[in-house]
Interface confidence: low
């Protein structure tokens, strides 16, 4: 008689789990001269602790302690690039402007991205059937916690000038309720960050409106600046060009407004 | 201990085809990137193509795309590569070797080479 | 035409130390990693040196790597007859998408 489960309505476990967190872990320490001392072993047991034989509605930060020790890594603090609803591009704007760097190009960003996960209360199985959604569920699964977790971090950590890509073809181009707009924006440390500058990208080719007036961006602009926190905004009429200028600036072609 | 064995080679006619096949043993084959490299005679060692670990990306060096294709079954431990439309330029020894762990690509050396099988074409 | 550029040739007498250059460029060298191999006459090629400067377990410590910039090295330290051979750097080409070669340095023994 199969054993009962418990029934989540978000997707579960990604397949082989373990081993591509295990095998990120060891790209990534290959790839990061200043990572190489990460033992990966201990990153996945610490990883794999935070979750198994808990129950995935009813973790916290505490449980992933162990795994921001392990992983804790120094980026430039004023080369931070936060995003919301357009991770694809902010990656592929990393990738080339390589001194800049999302969440997603830090270790544990790193092992995570685009990966679900979750255990069972008391037995030390990973779930592969379901895990709990974050709404339908519960906000204390696995996945929202380590997220939650790992952005507070990131923006502590932030200095300087702090840039935010935003998506103009979102109805809600700030969500607060987004991973940026409920723990990213709160946790700018304002004794350490001078500005942030949101870049909001446009989708349409012809779209020449100043999307940086949306009411969801001078929502964005007050919340900022109860924080003392200056605010600047950028319209990027057309992201195709915007790379392309990140890798070649010297065209002549990028000397137009993009 | 880590074996690559690769078979396949020998001689063929120029515009005929091949296909090799490098049986690995001694480690998990699924957790690897696999690549071909091959050695002309009397020359230095050339990059053919890389397979990562799912198969799900592939790459060859520009003078053999498009007749090439590499290719594996993670089932049987086999690293396989179709050769169609062979040139006399390319007569050389064809090594199978093992990459990083996971097809790094970054970090990309191969840590393990089987012997190597002679691929001649020649009317 | 090898895109990594190495001397074709090194020589040394027993004990010397032989140093082999391995030229590249942005897109290889130097944002990859380097690796070094040697092959013996007639076998396959053997790992040296991996991630710029690594010794796999086994390769004596008088073979020692190391990087700067767009080119890297390879030193060999107190010279032995068995060191006569080929030997290769190679790395990783992100513009090309695939790996990429020296064309081999021989060493001989002198």
């Known amino acids: 008689v199969p054993r009962w489960r418990q029934q989540w309505s978000g997707p579960g476990t990604t397949k082989r789990f373990p081993e591509t967190v295990l095998a990120r872990c060891v790209k990534y320490t290959e790839i990061h001269p200043e990572m190489r001392h990460v033992d990966c072993q201990s990153v996945w047991d610490a990883f794999k602790g935070a979750f198994i034989s808990k129950h995935p509605c009813n973790i916290t930060e505490e449980d992933y302690q162990p795994l921001m020790k392990l992983g804790t890594q120094t980026v430039p603090c004023n080369k931070i690039l936060l995003w919301s609803r357009i991770k694809d591009l902010a990656h592929q704007f990393t990738q080339v402007q390589r001194d800049m760097f999302t969440l997603e190009d830090t270790l544990l960003g790193y092992l995570a991205d685009d990966l679900t996960w979750c255990g069972e209360f008391n037995t030390s199985k990973i779930n592969y059937q379901s895990c709990p959604d974050w709404r339908k569920d519960c906000s204390n699964n696995p996945v929202s916690v380590f997220w939650k977790t790992v952005s507070r971090r990131f923006a502590e950590a932030a200095c300087d000038v702090v840039h935010v890509m935003l998506n103009g073809s979102r109805s809600k181009i700030f969500d607060k309720n987004s991973t940026f707009g409920s723990v990213e924006v709160h946790n700018l440390q304002p004794e350490k960050v001078q500005t942030l500058e949101a870049w909001v990208i446009h989708g349409g080719r012809e779209d020449s409106r100043d999307l940086c007036q949306d009411p969801t961006i001078k929502e964005l602009e007050s919340i900022i600046s109860k924080r003392n926190i200056q605010f600047s905004c950028k319209n990027i009429y057309r992201p195709d060009k915007f790379l392309q200028c990140v890798k070649n600036p010297e065209d002549s072609s990028c000397t137009s407004e993009i | 201990e880590v074996q690559l064995l690769e078979s396949g080679g020998g001689l063929v006619q120029p515009g005929g085809s091949l296909r090799l096949s490098c049986a690995a043993s001694?480690?998990?084959?699924?957790?690897?990137?696999m690549s071909w490299v091959r050695q002309a005679p009397g020359k230095g060692l050339e990059w053919v193509s890389d397979?990562?670990?799912?198969?799900?990306?592939?790459h060859y060096v520009d003078s053999v795309k498009g007749q090439f294709t590499i290719s594996r079954d993670n089932s049987k431990n086999t690293l396989y590569l179709q050769m169609n439309s062979l040139r006399a330029e390319d007569t050389a020894v064809y090594y199978c070797?093992?990459?990083?762990?996971?097809?790094?690509?970054?970090?990309?050396?191969?840590?393990?080479w089987g012997q190597g099988t002679l691929v001649t074409v020649s009317s | 035409q090898s895109v990594l550029t190495q001397p074709p040739s090194a020589s040394g007498t027993p004990g010397q130390r032989v140093t082999i250059s391995c030229s590249g460029s942005?897109?290889?060298?130097?944002?990859?990693?380097v690796s070094w191999y040697q092959q013996l006459p007639g076998t396959a090629p053997k790992l040296l040196i991996y991630?710029?400067?690594q010794r796999p377990s086994g390769v004596p410590d008088r073979f020692s790597g190391s990087k700067s910039g767009t080119s890297a090295s390879l030193a060999i330290s107190g010279l032995r007859s068995e060191d006569e051979a080929d030997y290769y750097c190679?790395?990783?080409?992100?513009?090309?998408?695939?790996?990429?070669f020296g064309g081999g340095t021989k060493v001989e023994i002198k």
């Open positions: 070797a093992r990459g990083s762990l996971f097809h790094d690509s970054s970090g990309f050396y191969f840590g393990h």
């Open positions: 001694g480690f998990t084959f699924d957790d690897y990137g």
């Open positions: 397979i990562s670990w799912n198969g799900g990306k592939t």
């Open positions: 942005s897109s290889n060298i130097g944002d990859n990693y």
């Open positions: 991630r710029d400067s």
């Open positions: 190679q790395s990783y080409d992100s513009s090309l998408s695939g790996s990429v």
